[in-house]
């Protein structure tokens, strides 16, 4: 057979669909690999071919498009299941070809079972809502293209297992779910069930997403350095270990990159010769504010080290801050018999 550009198994697009529900799967070639769309390919005389490998099998086989009620069909660059069955799980390949050109890609499709409370192994998208930020909406995802605009589906929303009716601050509005004022108590999994008719049959689409209530931009502040601070002095003798934590609180900011770093005498620790180690840890609050701690450690500090400037820096989309640690050499305690005695006039 002639050479075919094989994009391999595209595991980035791990497609999961619920059992016994319609699924429409677009060939990834046109979305992610080729610079032209299906219409262009079709008008250039290219043909799109589908085949699959069943779960735990190595044999590629054609897809059976002659099942009762057209359970599996193809329409342009979309593979349709009306509905899926559990044993449809496998690796699917779409191949675009003519006599001189060939390109193909495979992708995994997993048909997933759900229980009566919509729990399943499905990986859920996360939608972030700002805490106490006024009306915010989530939309029932991935339902476009399943039915024409002339069809008016019924949509039912659930939080966890419970149908959303007479909730204090959550109101179903068709495909949208409105949160009047998002609170931590609104964290959880929300499911929309879309029911629509097609050719005398009734189909259900189930879509679950996780709502996570996060810090509001109106509460966001530049990074706050809690340590080092003016109230703490690192007083050490040469030979002792010097440990200085830099602890920084970052407000949650969508898509912000939070950074913490130390400078010693104005240089990054990597650029100086002293034996310094830095360990970082990160923790998050329930609204995804972030506390980053970088502990600067010098195992055996020298008197030179105790004269250096140690500055902690932090940066987020809200701004940049810096704070110097107060480091000094401990004055040795006087030996009573000699120094103090002299002070009291002893000879």
């Amino acid at each position: 057979s002639e050479r075919c550009d094989d994009w391999g198994l595209d595991t980035m697009r791990q497609i999961q669909v619920f059992e016994d529900e319609p699924a429409r799967i677009k060939c990834p070639l046109f979305e992610h690999f080729l610079k032209f769309n299906y219409s262009t390919a079709h008008s250039a005389g290219l043909t799109l071919i589908w085949y699959w490998t069943r779960q735990d099998r190595d044999l590629e086989e054609p897809i059976n498009f002659r099942l009762p009620e057209n359970r599996i069909s193809k329409e342009k660059d979309v593979l349709w299941f009306r509905p899926t069955l559990l044993n449809d799980t496998g690796n699917y390949t779409c191949m675009l070809r003519n006599t001189t050109y060939c390109s193909k890609v495979a992708f995994p499709l997993e048909v997933v079972q759900k229980d009566s409370c919509f729990n399943s192994p499905m990986k859920l998208p996360v939608h972030k809502l700002y805490i106490e930020y006024g009306i915010q909406r989530i939309t029932c995802p991935n339902v476009d293209g399943y039915f024409p605009s002339s069809v008016k589906p019924t949509i039912t929303w659930y939080m966890g297992c419970y149908k959303i009716q007479n909730f204090n601050n959550v109101i179903p509005e068709g495909m949208n779910l409105s949160f009047l004022i998002a609170l931590i108590s609104n964290n959880g999994n929300y499911t929309c069930v879309v029911t629509y008719p097609e050719n005398g049959r009734t189909f259900h689409l189930t879509r679950t997403l996780t709502v996570k209530v996060v810090g509001s931009p109106k509460n966001a502040v530049p990074p706050v350095i809690h340590s080092p601070n003016d109230h703490v002095v690192y007083e050490k003798e040469p030979g002792e270990e010097l440990l200085i934590p830099c602890t920084v609180y970052f407000s949650f900011l969508m898509d912000s990159r939070n950074e913490v770093w130390w400078t010693i005498d104005g240089k990054k620790p990597d650029d100086i010769t002293i034996d310094v180690t830095i360990n970082e840890s990160i923790s998050h609050s329930r609204t995804e504010d972030e506390t980053r701690t970088q502990i600067l450690s010098i195992k055996k500090v020298t008197s030179e080290d105790l004269k250096r400037s140690y500055v902690c820096h932090a940066r987020s989309a809200k701004g940049e801050v810096a704070k110097a640690a107060k480091v000094k050499q401990k004055v040795p305690a006087p030996r009573y018999t000699v120094e103090l005695a002299c002070g009291f006039g002893a000879t």
Partner: antibody, heavy 123, light 112 residues
Framework: EVQLVQSGAEVKKPGASVKVSCKAS????????MNWVRQAPGQGLEWVGQ????????YYAQKFQGRVTMTVDTSTSTVYMELSSLRSEDTAVYYC????????????????WGQGTLVTVSS | DIQLTQSPSSLSASVGDRATITCRAS??????????MHWYQQKPGKAPKLLIK???DLESGVPSRFSGSGSGTDFTLTISSVQPEDFATYYC??????????FGQGTKLEIK
């Protein structure tokens, strides 16, 4: 999970000293202030002082200056509070409590508390 | 030193009632953007538990029936609908600058 576990109850005579320990786990010990708060029987809460484990820096309430010493052992993530020249009015439950970090630069709250250590001063 | 005065010193309420406790500071404990006033709940024989920090921010895991408000010198803790487990003593606490922390004298919430 953050935990503060304190040493057991103590009975002391007036004029003696007592040393109470508080072992921390579940967080980066050296980076949070540790406070000591006491509560006499049937009374309210009274702040004694605080220590920053990374440096050993201490601050004490005026009332306890000269009688209280707070120390730290970073190898065991333990803070100690020693109170000397005990008198009967020092009979109280002594709590260690961690200072939190938040989006503000000061004015910290106490977010985790030990279970308390009862110190009884009696002749 | 800043003094904190809580009122009332005791409060009787029934399950489902709204309960309000106030705390007045002898001088302002607010600065640009925040107030360093916190509220704790203490049950007999137990350590205090942080409920509200910085005047109005609910601590993680605390039921939303608890709320805090106020700024400057006057602060309020409100329980919108008292539950059986809410009968306890409540303390306000300010931490205005190191090294001085002060607590209010406490308010005992009792069953009516």
């Amino acid at each position: 999970e953050v935990q503060l576990v304190q040493s057991g109850a103590e009975v002391k005579k007036p004029g003696a000293s007592v040393k109470v320990s508080c072992k921390a786990s579940g967080y980066i010990f050296i980076t949070y202030w540790m406070n000591w708060v006491r509560q006499a029987p049937g009374q309210g809460l009274e702040w004694v002082g605080q220590i920053f484990p990374a440096s050993g820096t201490t601050y004490y309430a005026q009332k306890f200056q000269g009688r209280v010493t707070m120390t730290v052992d970073t190898s065991t993530s333990t803070v100690y509070m020693e109170l000397s020249s005990l008198r009967s009015e020092d009979t109280a439950v002594y709590y260690c409590a961690r200072t939190d970090f938040y989006r503000y630069e000061g004015g910290y709250a106490l977010d985790y508390w030990g279970q308390g250590t009862l110190v009884t001063v009696s002749s | 030193d800043i003094q904190l005065t809580q009122s009332p010193s005791s409060l009787s309420a029934s399950v489902g009632d709204r309960a309000t406790i106030t705390c007045r500071a002898s001088q302002s404990v607010s600065t640009s953007g925040y107030s360093s006033m916190h509220w704790y709940q203490q049950k007999p024989g137990k350590a205090p538990k942080l409920l509200i920090k910085y005047a109005s921010d609910l601590e993680s895991g605390v039921p939303s029936r608890f709320s805090g408000s106020g700024s400057g010198t006057d602060f309020t803790l409100t329980i919108s609908s008292v539950q059986p487990e809410d009968f306890a003593t409540y303390y306000c606490h300010h931490s205005w600058g190191i090294p001085m922390y002060t607590f209010g004298q406490g308010t005992k919430l009792e069953i009516k």
